[in-house]
Interface confidence: medium
């Protein structure tokens, strides 16, 4: 689709005569008929196959034709066509005299023709006007012409339709040849696909408008390249969504079980060596001169009560010294100059003579000890409490204060965490050295099998080492039922199970 445009510029008919030679009175009131047709080697009469147009009277005898002439006609004259421009044409321009106001052919005298020109040739589509001048013995016509495409038509023959758009169906403008040129931020055959934020992950992100990056379920971050770990995952990471791969030193389905208390909490003081001894438990090996569970106490050499027979101990830089009570001597006041006559036995102890009365021995009542019954018995010195229990003296008895998970007079019994049935939804409970673990039935997850799991999450086959994957609602969770010898949210950790497990 396009338009052949003809710009009439100047017509000269100095003598004011018709083609027949007759003069117009008072002058030739001139209008034009234009006929556009297909190329003919010799332009001959026949239909104006490409269109025709007539002007109103534009002037008398000789005149210049201005743009959009006041006579009501349009200049340039428009001859629209709705076909592929062939690149060639024939053009006939006739100048006619109008004695009256009726310009219809049948209303004109037969000899009203002033002049007639005919041209033909090739004419490419373009903005440039071609200027031409045709003369006859009595007249001269100056004009220019061109072919341009209609709005939205492009190409050498105005046959390529392209309508710029910026809406749901596409975002583009048109190139001179009619091809699409996408607006910034759009791509695709019709520029209908937004260009996402640079770096937006191809699979995990998408966009509905340019420079956007919307994450698919299970992914997060500006570029949707970070997976979202399992809900409740404490000390773990993921490489695919909803995983919980434990950081070093952590275990359990949610990586919330501390397997490396030493590293995470550094409980041992004063340069002591820490050894992990189970989940959330540890042992400190103290450097010389320190004591206590965490080696937090500085050890005085007097703490071991080296002075006998009521001698008092004094700390010194190079050790200690015993200040002996009257009647005793020696490094630890271990030698006595006393006899039973000096009543050396304290706290109701009875004195027994030895070596014909030259020395003695004290028989102490219960709860007292020492060569003179001067020391109260400490029933905790033998470390009677097992499993890290704390020993307390209570009058004539001693009591063990047990750590969580242990009981018995000596904390020698392990409490079963499974006794209170902590596993929900029919989960099976297994006691560990400290704590418990639940084996959940199909469709449940969580430390206590309290979380219902989705179906879709198993599609990616997240469970390892032959584990069974169970899913439920909401559709973004899974749980792995591990075979014997494996633990972890994906059954990724091999473990040696305690023999007490019931399977």
């Amino acid at each position: 689709s396009g338009v052949f445009q003809l710009q009439l510029q100047e017509f000269a008919n100095e003598r004011g005569v018709l083609a027949s030679g007759r003069r117009c009175e008072p002058g030739c009131r001139t209008f034009f008929r234009v006929c556009l047709k297909h190329f003919q080697a010799v332009v001959s009469p026949g239909p104006c196959t490409f269109g025709s147009v007539s002007t109103p009277v534009l002037g008398t005898n000789s005149f210049a034709v201005g743009d959009d002439s006041s006579g009501g006609g349009r200049n340039p004259l428009q001859l629209p066509f709705n076909f592929t421009w062939p690149g060639t044409f024939s053009l006939i321009i006739e100048a006619w005299h109008a004695p009256g106001d009726d310009l219809r052919p049948e209303a004109l005298p037969p000899d009203a023709l002033i002049s007639k020109i005919a041209i033909q040739g090739s004419l490419p589509v373009g903005q440039k006007w071609l200027l031409d001048e045709q003369t006859s013995p009595l007249t001269r016509l100056r004009y220019s012409y061109r072919v341009i495409c209609s709005d939205n038509y492009y190409g050498d023959s105005c046959s390529r339709l392209c309508k710029k758009r910026n809406d749901h169906f596409g975002h583009y403008v048109c190139q001179p040849d009619g091809s699409l040129s996408c607006l910034p931020g759009w791509t695709g055959e019709y520029c209908e696909q937004p260009v996402c934020l640079s770096g937006c992950h191809e699979q995990n992100g998408y966009c509905s408008k340019p420079a956007e990056c919307i994450c698919r379920p299970g992914w997060q971050g500006r570029l949707c390249n970070e997976c979202i770990p399992h809900n409740g995952c404490r000390h773990g990471t993921c490489s695919t969504p909803w995983q919980c791969t434990c950081d070093e030193g952590w275990g359990g389905l949610f990586c919330d079980q501390d397997l490396n208390y030493c590293t995470h909490h550094s409980p041992c003081k004063n340069g002591a060596t820490c050894s992990n001894s189970g989940q959330r438990s540890y042992t400190c090996t103290c450097r010389p001169g320190y004591t206590g569970v965490d080696c937090e106490l500085e050890l005085s050499e007097c703490d071991s009560n080296p002075c006998r027979n009521g001698g008092s101990c004094k700390d010194q830089e190079d050790g200690y010294r015993c200040l002996c009570p009257p009647g005793y001597y020696g490094l630890h006041c271990e030698h006595s100059t006393l006899t039973c006559a000096d009543s050396p036995c304290f706290n109701g102890g009875s004195c027994q003579e030895r070596n014909q009365g030259a020395s003695y021995a004290c028989e102490c009542p219960p709860n007292f000890t020492g060569s003179n019954c001067e020391k109260k018995v400490d029933r905790c010195t033998s470390n009677p409490c097992a499993n890290g229990g704390q020993c307390l003296n209570r009058g004539p008895n001693r009591v063990c204060r047990c750590r969580p998970g242990f009981t018995g007079a000596h904390c020698e019994l392990h409490i079963s965490d499974c006794a209170r049935s902590p596993c929900a939804h029919g989960g099976t409970c297994h006691d560990l050295e400290t704590g418990f673990v639940c084996t959940c039935p199909a469709g449940f997850s969580g430390r206590r099998c309290e979380v219902r799991i989705p179906t879709e999450a198993c599609a990616s086959g997240p469970c390892l080492n032959g584990a069974t994957c169970y899913t439920g609602l909401p559709p973004d969770n899974f749980v792995c039922n591990c075979p014997y010898g494996f633990v972890g949210s994906r059954c990724e950790f091999p473990v040696s199970m305690p023999p007490s497990f019931p399977w």
Epitope: S150, N152, K163, K164, N166, H168, V173
Partner: antibody
Framework: SGGGLVQPGRSMKLSCAAS????????MAWVRQDPKKGLEWVAT????????YYRDSVKGRFTISRDNAKSTLYLQMDSLRSEDTATYYC??????????????WGQGISVTVSS | DIVLTQSPALAVTLGQRATISCRAS??????????MQWYQQRPGRQPKLLIY???NLASGIPARFSGSGSGTDFTLTIDPVQADDIATYYC?????????FGGGTKLELR
């Protein structure tokens, strides 16, 4: 055609018969106007009827369709609400410009949603 | 969505120039195209396209109507105003979906 008074929650179907241009060549749209919210684009359909788009507030309730053989555009409105009260105009969609900037608009259909 | 803001009313004198403005909440210019239209609506009638792409006169619209602007600020000018021009004028952007209209400026006689 097809407007009038309707109760909230009920349905109504609007029709728009086109003439004077090649209907099947143009994307079409419904635009509505009410005194409070002014002019508001409602829905668009592609020239071949394959693609449709809706404003968020009518998505899932309104359906735009066309019959190119009859040069007719439709708007099926379900679960109507009082805020859908407006004059509804059909028009050729401005994404596909007419030569020389011509546009075709319907004369408008009044829809009142009230109990 | 792009919000278009127009002043509600403008009082004019016949034969004088009227300038109606429209401001967009973000630029509606893209690749040198200013994607803004102007419509005239007389009471009880459908809107009529006056200007497309900010400055192009629609088919059959008299030359006393003109449009200008780019980015976020656009203007419709009527010079001179005739009695027939007393109506409400709306701007509309085609930069983004959904298409949005301004609230309209009512041209009133002073």
């Amino acid at each position: 055609s097809g407007g009038g008074l309707v109760q909230p929650g009920r349905s109504m179907k609007l029709s728009c018969a086109a003439s004077g241009f090649t209907f099947s060549n143009y994307d079409m749209a419904w635009v509505r106007q009410d005194p409070k919210k002014g002019l508001e684009w409602v829905a668009t359909i592609s020239y071949d009827g394959r693609s449709t788009y809706y404003r968020d507030s009518v998505k899932g309730r309104f359906t735009i369709s066309r019959d190119n053989a009859k040069s007719t555009l439709y708007l099926q409105m379900d679960s109507l609400r009082s805020e859908d009260t407006a004059t509804y105009y059909c028009k050729d969609y401005d994404g596909h410009y007419h030569p020389y900037g011509m546009e075709a608009w319907g004369q408008g259909i009044s829809v009142t949603v009230s109990s | 969505d792009i919000v278009l803001t127009q002043s509600p009313a403008l009082a004019v004198t016949l034969g004088q120039r009227a300038t109606i403005s429209c401001r967009a909440s973000q630029s509606v210019t893209i690749s040198n195209y200013n994607l803004m239209q102007w419509y005239q609506q007389r009471p009880g009638r459908q809107p009529k396209l006056l200007i497309y792409d900010a400055s192009n006169l629609a088919s059959g619209i008299p030359a006393r109507f003109s449009g200008s602007g780019s980015g976020t600020d656009f203007t419709l000018t009527i010079d001179p105003v005739q009695a027939d021009d007393i109506a409400t004028y709306y701007c509309q952007q085609s930069r983004d979906d959904p298409r949005t209209f301004g609230g309209g400026t009512k041209l009133e006689l002073r």
